[in-house]
């Protein structure tokens, strides 16, 4: 396993609709044709997998149908979007990139993006 640099933004604020987007960029050390991208969430020293996708270079990033993530790839950067976020989902979201094929295998893990999610206030009843 060889190490690889990964960059991602330090902080992102989710929209009022609970959507957060960020770029994950990796320093590809060679001609990888198969890449796997995983988003991990770290909160209270617990790390859980949020979503993952494997893609072939030049093709679209495809997550499972029930995934809360969507994304697009362009060269050695991936544009990730996480949907359905609520305040309790606030945490550090880490981008993990693996160059699966051809060998050698490379692994890169970013420093994480702190995503802040604020639940919208309910609209007050209006007396009209």
């Amino acid at each position: 396993c060889k190490a690889m640099h990964v960059a991602q933004p330090a902080v992102v604020l989710a929209s009022s609709r609970g959507i957060a987007s960020f770029v994950c960029e990796y320093a590809s050390p060679g001609k990888a044709t198969e890449v796997r991208v995983t988003v991990l969430r770290q909160a209270d020293s617990q790390v859980t997998e949020v979503c993952a996708a494997t893609y072939m270079m030049g093709n679209e990033l495809t997550f499972l149908d029930d995934s809360i993530c969507t994304g697009t790839s362009s060269g050695n950067q991936v544009n990730l979007t996480i949907q359905g976020l609520r305040a309790m989902d606030t945490g550090l979201y880490i981008c993990k990139v693996e160059l699966m094929y051809p060998p050698p295998y490379y692994l890169g893990i970013g420093n994480g993006t702190q995503i802040y999610v604020i639940d919208p206030e309910p609209c007050p009843d209006s007396d009209f």
């Epitope: 640099h5 990964v6 960059a7 991602q8 770029v23 960029e25 990796y26 320093a27 590809s28 050390p29 060679g30 001609k31 990888a32 044709t33 270079m57 030049g58 060269g75 050695n76 950067q77």
Partner: nanobody, 126 residues
Framework: EVQLVESGGGLVQPGGSLRLSCAAS????????VGWFRQAPGKEREELSC????????DYPGSVKGRFTITRDNSKNTVYLQMNSLRAEDTAVYYC???????????????????WGQGTQVTVSS
Amino acid sequence: EVQLVESGGGLVQPGGSLRLSCAASGDTLESFAVGWFRQAPGKEREELSCIGRTGEFTDYPGSVKGRFTITRDNSKNTVYLQMNSLRAEDTAVYYCAAERLVFHLCSLSEYDYDTWGQGTQVTVSS
């Protein structure tokens, strides 16, 4: 749309040095990571080096590490490849390529670059 033009190639004796330039027009190069590649007749294109947008991140394959150095001058919209201790097997057409990125990294994979120069010939011979 950024356009790239390589220069600085030519004939050099074994053991000699050359500095190649990759000049950009049409856009500011500071928005782009830049890579250098070469292709010898009958061979696949080979990665040589890359440099991130700010110049703080560079990468080289083992084959040229220590002999080749990549630098950039964003004020001149130019990236340079300094090549020392040249050998006959370094004879090839040398290309630079650019990729618009968000952060400071760069890629050694030709698949990641979407803008290429026309190339400059380097011949190492006595």
